[in-house]
């Protein structure tokens, strides 16, 4: 058992059928000594009488507020919440696996430049009594701090029969250089309580690999003088590492008719502009990425032909 | 990724296309590494990620752009120790700051060099025969420090008298490549700076 | 005490359906995921498919995935394993299982696939 | 389809002491516990083994179980001619958990 908060308790179950549970000692935090009488939740029945309460912890039912009383008078709470290892594996129910860049990605977290800024964010099915906690560090072992705000919900989507809600969080490491080369990766760490149930994820990454740069800006189209050519331009985004000489982009134009199924023309150039040839109703496409570390392509930024 | 490659012009910054090529070489053997290496601790996520050139030379911060030299946190260890002076630099535009940095850049291909060369000497060895240094890579840092034209002592190949342990040889190989690539990445975006400026 | 106990088992035709059911008692079936394991005559052991304690995530082997489905009735205390387009390859018997460090098992009950 | 390695075969005489070794990898043996089985015939398997090196109560302390970095192994000191059986390790992959990856099975023979 340990302290999440004040006055909220972890008990670490070995979840499995008739399992023995964990014996858990309850103390009331007051100097009285006689009277005092326990309760769990809102139930009025008493489980025990003095200062202490013993208790044998094997399931959600035996999780909630303990409370101790005298003379009708509460004197204090403990809140128990259980924490489940299910075959030496801690539980994962409250969140769901996004399953992208791999298995078993709980978190996921992006950042759209060097400075040190970045975002993570979680799905679940779950709509009430739940809540988050954020914690982030540089390393483990000698953390160096980043500060995350607090969760919030982020969207709503439907998925068949399923609501899914998708929880988001910012975070910033206190003493960034964009031009610094990590060696220790940025940790993340979420508590998740879903009623009596607790959770936690962990996320370890380097910014230089959850880079994806926001889509090119003001995408434009010259047409070239006597020719079914047109002359491309777009800039770095706004939100891009500076100077642009020293954090570079390279961008891929593509040109995409209407129909999916028609063959796309791609280029890829670290300039600026590109010159290509526009199809009737096709629409021209232009995304980037660091173009000397080999992180996430950017959305697409697109415009039509015509 | 397959980029067209762009060839530069001859008064062009010379050092930028041999960065480039760097650049391509080890992420090209840190690819073949993790493919070859399957079985070993050799992703990003597994290895230590060790700096050979720690507190031994200074790339990150005599090559820090003017724009980045206000923001605190990238002067914290800003010790610089490098005065010489390197063909890679239009006479004209030779300054302190310009000399410190690429000295630094070729220390660290120097340094990189021998580990490397040492290394594959013990992977020679191997009776499985399982994963070499990639001779072009080699070249390639060849190529940048003889454009770079620092005059430095030269650093004598560490040889082993030990029976070389293998398994460690090919995991000290993932975590030099991975060290390797992020410098080569600071390199090139150093070279793309200076030829910009 | 846990107890597991399954039926469903028989002879069918390839292509054709069969469901087992396993039937829980002896503890609060609703909190714990439950596996299904089978093992063909003279072979090794094969997990099948595993349900989560509320029936939300399902897991399937490969060799079944699109023709097999686990549900549970929370309600009834039992696992189900529904089998479709059954092939001789599936002719084996068939486990269920709890999900823990400390793991209860049915009695087994044979799938015979064969025309 | 079975990532998880075992000999087919061990055999001892009564008293021996005989060990039943379990391959695997980085992503299962390495990063998960180990389990193991025993299988007497027609019976379903019978849990010897949890948590790499534990044992539930009801075992014999002559099996003991240990794991060193993608590899565990089972032991049976004192074998007796009762523990005649296919025993089965069982492992998780990190990336497909809670799919169970059971070993090929060895077949214990106590001679004489």
């Known amino acids: 058992i340990w302290e999440l908060k004040k006055d909220v308790y972890v008990v670490e179950l070995d979840w499995y059928p008739d399992a023995p549970g964990e014996m858990v000692v309850l103390t009331c935090d007051t100097p009285e000594e006689d009277g005092i009488t326990w309760t769990l939740d809102q139930s009025s029945e008493v489980l025990g009488s003095g200062k202490t309460l013993t208790i044998q912890v094997k399931e959600f039912g035996d999780a909630g507020q303990y409370t101790c009383h005298k003379g009708g008078e509460v004197l204090s709470h403990s809140l128990l919440l259980l924490h489940k290892k299910e075959d030496g594996i801690w539980s994962t129910d409250i969140l769901k696996d996004q399953k992208e860049p791999k298995n078993k990605t709980f978190l996921r977290c992006e950042a759209k430049n060097y400075s040190g800024r970045f975002t993570c964010w979680w799905l679940t099915t779950i709509s009430t009594d739940l809540t988050f906690s954020v914690k982030s560090s540089r390393g483990s072992s000698d953390p160096q701090g980043v500060t995350c705000g607090a969760a919030t919900l982020s969207a709503e989507r439907v998925r068949g029969d399923n609501k899914e809600y998708e929880y988001s969080v910012e975070c910033q490491e206190d003493s960034a250089c964009p031009a610094a080369e990590e060696s220790l990766p940025i940790e993340v760490m979420v508590d998740a309580v879903h009623k009596l149930k607790y959770e936690n994820y962990t996320s370890s990454f380097f910014i230089r690999d959850i880079i994806k740069p926001d889509p090119p800006k003001n995408l434009q189209l010259k047409p070239l003088k006597n020719s079914r050519q047109v002359e491309v331009s777009w800039e770095y985004p706004d939100t891009w590492s500076t100077p642009h000489s020293y954090f570079s982009l390279t961008f891929c134009v593509q040109v995409q008719g209407k129909s999916k199924r028609e063959k796309k023309d791609r280029v890829f150039t670290d300039k600026t502009s590109a010159t290509v040839i526009c199809r009737k109703n096709a629409s021209i496409s232009v995304r980037a990425q660091d173009r000397y570390y080999s992180s996430s392509w950017s959305e697409w930024a697109s415009v039509p032909c015509s | 990724r397959n980029l067209p490659v762009a060839t530069p012009d001859p008064g062009m910054f010379p050092c930028l296309h041999h960065s480039q090529n760097l650049l391509r070489a080890v992420s090209n053997m840190l690819q073949k590494a993790r493919q070859t290496l399957e079985f070993y601790p050799c992703t990003s996520e597994e290895i230590d990620h060790e700096d050979i050139t720690k507190d031994k030379t200074s790339t990150v911060e005599a090559c820090l752009p003017l724009e980045l030299t206000k923001n605190e946190s990238c002067l914290n260890s800003r010790e610089t120790s490098f005065i010489t002076n390197g063909s890679c630099l239009a006479s004209r535009k030779t300054s302190f700051m310009m000399a410190l940095c690429l000295s630094s850049i070729y220390e660290d291909l120097k340094m990189y060099q021998v580990e490397f060369k040492t290394m594959n000497a013990k992977l020679l060895m191997d009776p499985k025969r399982q994963i070499f240094l990639d001779q072009n890579m080699l070249a390639v840092i060849d190529e940048l420090m003889q454009a770079l034209n620092f005059n430095s002592e030269t650093v004598p190949q560490k040889s082993s008298l030990e029976e070389p342990d293998f398994y460690k040889t090919k995991i000290k190989l993932c975590i030099l490549l991975h060290a390797f690539r992020i410098r080569a990445v600071t390199i090139d975006r150093v070279m793309s700076y200076l030829n910009a400026s | 005490q846990v107890q597991l106990v399954q039926s469903g088992g028989g002879v069918v035709q390839p292509g054709r359906s069969l469901r087992l059911s396993c039937a829980a008692s002896?503890?609060?079936?609703?909190?714990?995921?439950m596996h299904w394991v089978r093992q063909a005559p003279g072979k090794g052991l094969e997990w099948v498919a595993f349900?989560?304690?509320?029936?939300?995530?399902?897991y399937y082997a490969d060799s079944v995935k699109g023709r097999f489905t686990i549900s549970r009735d929370n309600s009834k205390n039992t696992l189900y394993l529904q089998m479709k387009s059954l092939r001789a390859e599936d002719t084996a018997v068939y486990y269920c299982k709890t999900h823990g460090s400390h793991d209860n098992w049915g009695q087994g009950t044979m799938v015979t696939v064969s025309s | 389809s079975y990532v998880l390695t075992q000999p087919p075969s061990v055999s001892g005489t009564p008293g021996q002491r005989v060990t039943i070794s379990c391959s695997g990898g980085?992503?299962?043996?390495?990063?998960?516990?180990v389990k193991w089985y025993q299988q007497l015939p027609g019976t379903a398997p019978k849990l010897l083994i949890y948590?790499?090196?534990q044992r539930p109560s009801g075992v014999p302390d002559r099996f003991s179980g240990s794991k060193s970095g993608t590899s565990a192994s089972l032991a049976i000191t004192g074998v007796q001619a009762e523990d005649e059986a296919d025993y089965y390790c069982?492992?998780?992959?990190?990336?497909?958990?809670?799919?169970?990856?059971f070993g090929t099975g060895t077949k214990l023979t106590v001679l004489g």
């Open positions: 948590g790499n090196d």
């Open positions: 349900i989560r304690y509320d029936g939300s995530n399902k």
């Open positions: 069982q492992s998780y992959d990190r990336g497909t958990h809670p799919a169970l990856l």
């Open positions: 980085r992503s299962n043996i390495g990063s998960n516990t």
């Open positions: 002896g503890f609060t079936f609703s909190s714990y995921g």
